[in-house]
């Protein structure tokens, strides 16, 4: 922390300038007054401050705004913005989608995650869901960011925004965020024909239930391995070797590849060996022909 | 060991226009904010500007706005000085210097880089 | 901006002699910073924020003052002193240098 002292006459400061460069954080801590610094809070981004000197000024909105910045020092918080931390933006209430472009310039190509996914949620909690403006920003500025949301904000989706959403958007969409997703995108392209509807689905597909791949399956659709190593494990175990065959089309070679990983290691230990010899890839693993397979979950749970 | 290593000496015609380097090793790049400074003559000293190595964000010397434009490459931990529409009053030596920690002085000063401009 | 006035402009000393070199500000500064440079080579921290010695500095180097007025001092003038020493202020923008006191040795 920096030591109080009393500022020197000759370093008051009466506007927040380049001539701040050479100050100490002593002299920072005494010399700026941060309703100053609050109101110019624009000119900060353009003057070469040190890491230290930047601790130092956001030290003093701190101090300013002990419950969280005003939208009009957050929108111009430029470089000081990487010295933010979750628990900071958790007390902010930012409305603005120029805000949210604003700092998620700033933060691209440093290390942000957290505070970047602390950022939108905030942003969707201000604006009250996640609507098509705030989605088509994210797109453009932040690709791979929607899937910072959680599951319950993702939920406050339209199914009408879905359309804006690109594939690399959902890269890193995990599991839950997708099972969120799933039913607003097949809602969203419900009105499509077979092909095009595939191509729209394609990348929500790991929220997919099982009954929903088995009539994908029945639709000539081709999905590439990529696809279907995302679908979720529990769509993916009840197929039979006749559906994945059709699901997969041409593409039903890469299985061999993909032998080792789930969701088809768990599949392919599911399946009769001797349905799995009719595909004449070698996949070996299935159940050995004669034996019984007793589901006791299902004994399990009527008793 | 901490270096600034600058480029060597170069020789321009008037109106053209130079870029000089200074390659830091040693310490992390980006911690520091790199000052550019001139000496003509071997006599007194006049700084020019500093760039924040983090952000790219510089500011110059009054005197020296629109002469100088000072950039960084972080990949290489590279800083450079272009300076443009250059005279004979441009003629002089060059030196990168980095702040040390809360503002300390210019702790490490690079070797220096001879701009001769003649025609 | 603020003119750094030093002097003397040249001085000699001799061995194991007592030296004392000043700076003069046209308004009041902060701190006061000092630069050693030898012919040929780059300038060299000596003192930083008044009276703090750099890393690698012989204790024999000390600096003092306040408000416009500052001085460096050698303690014991050694043959690897003679040089050109230069103050500098950054207390207001921007930083300036002096003009500089050439130390010979005798």
């Known amino acids: 922390d920096v030591e109080r002292t009393t500022c020197p006459p000759e370093k008051e400061v009466h506007e927040i300038d380049e001539s701040l460069i050479f100050y100490k954080k002593r002299e920072l801590e005494a010399c700026v007054d941060a309703a100053l610094l609050a109101a110019q809070m624009d000119r900060v981004d353009a003057i070469p401050f040190t890491y230290e000197q930047l601790d130092v000024l956001k030290h003093k909105l701190d101090e300013l705004y002990p419950q969280g910045y005003p939208e009009s020092v957050i929108r111009h918080l430029g470089h000081l913005f990487l010295k933010m931390s979750p628990e900071d933006i958790r007390k902010w209430n930012v409305t603005s989608l120029e805000t949210l472009k604003a700092l998620l310039k700033v933060s691209k190509g440093h290390e942000m995650s957290a505070q970047v996914a602390t950022l939108i949620d905030r942003v969707v909690v201000g604006r009250g869901q996640l609507d098509k403006d705030t989605v088509d920003t994210l797109t453009a500025f932040c690709p791979g960011c929607l899937c910072s949301l959680s599951p319950e904000r993702l939920s406050s989706v339209p199914p009408s925004v879905i359309g804006a959403v690109r594939p690399q958007d959902l890269d890193t969409c995990g599991p839950r965020q997708l099972d969120v997703l799933y039913p607003k995108a097949r809602l969203a392209f419900q009105n499509m024909s077979g092909s095009e509807y595939f191509v729209k689905i394609r990348p929500f597909l790991g929220g997919a239930p099982t009954e929903d791949v088995k009539a994908l399956s029945q639709q000539n659709v081709s999905m590439d391995l990529a696809t279907f190593m995302k679908l979720r494990r529990e769509a993916v175990l009840p197929l039979t070797v006749a559906e994945v065959q059709k699901l997969l089309g041409p593409h039903v070679e890469g299985l061999k590849v993909e032998e080792q990983h789930s969701p088809v290691r768990d599949w392919i230990l599911k399946q009769r060996q001797d349905d799995l010899d009719t595909l004449g890839l070698g996949l070996q693993g299935g159940i050995p022909n004669g034996y019984l397979i007793l589901d006791l979950s299902v004994r399990e749970a009527l008793s | 060991e901490f270096q600034l290593q600058q480029s060597g000496p170069e020789l321009v015609k008037p109106g053209a226009s130079v870029k000089i380097s200074c390659k830091a090793s040693g310490y992390s790049f980006t911690d520091y904010n790199m000052n550019w400074v001139k000496q003509t003559n071997g006599k007194s000293l006049e700084w020019i500007g500093i760039i924040n190595p983090n952000y790219g964000t510089s500011s110059y010397n009054q005197k020296f706005k629109g002469k100088a434009t000072l950039t960084v490459d972080q990949s290489s931990s590279t800083a450079y000085m272009q300076l443009n529409s250059l005279t004979s009053e441009d003629s002089a030596v060059y030196y990168c210097?980095?702040?040390?920690?809360?503002?300390?002085?210019?702790?490490?000063w690079g070797q220096g880089t001879t701009l001769t401009v003649s025609s | 901006q603020i003119v750094l006035t030093q002097s003397p402009a040249i001085m000699s000393a001799s061995p194991g002699e007592k030296v004392t070199m000043t700076c003069s500000a046209s308004?009041?500064?902060?701190?006061m910073y000092w630069y050693q440079q030898k012919p040929g080579s780059s300038p060299r921290l000596l003192i930083y924020d008044t009276s703090n010695l750099a890393s690698g500095v012989p204790v024999r180097f000390s600096g003092s003052g306040s408000g416009t007025s500052y001085s460096l001092t050698i303690s014991r003038m050694e043959a690897e002193d003679a040089a050109t020493y230069y103050c500098?202020?950054?207390?207001?923008?921007?930083?300036?240098f002096g003009s500089g006191t050439e130390l010979e040795i005798k």
């Open positions: 500098q202020q950054w207390s207001s923008y921007p930083p300036t």
């Open positions: 308004s009041s500064v902060s701190y």
């Open positions: 210097a980095r702040v040390g920690r809360d503002n300390s002085g210019f702790d490490y």
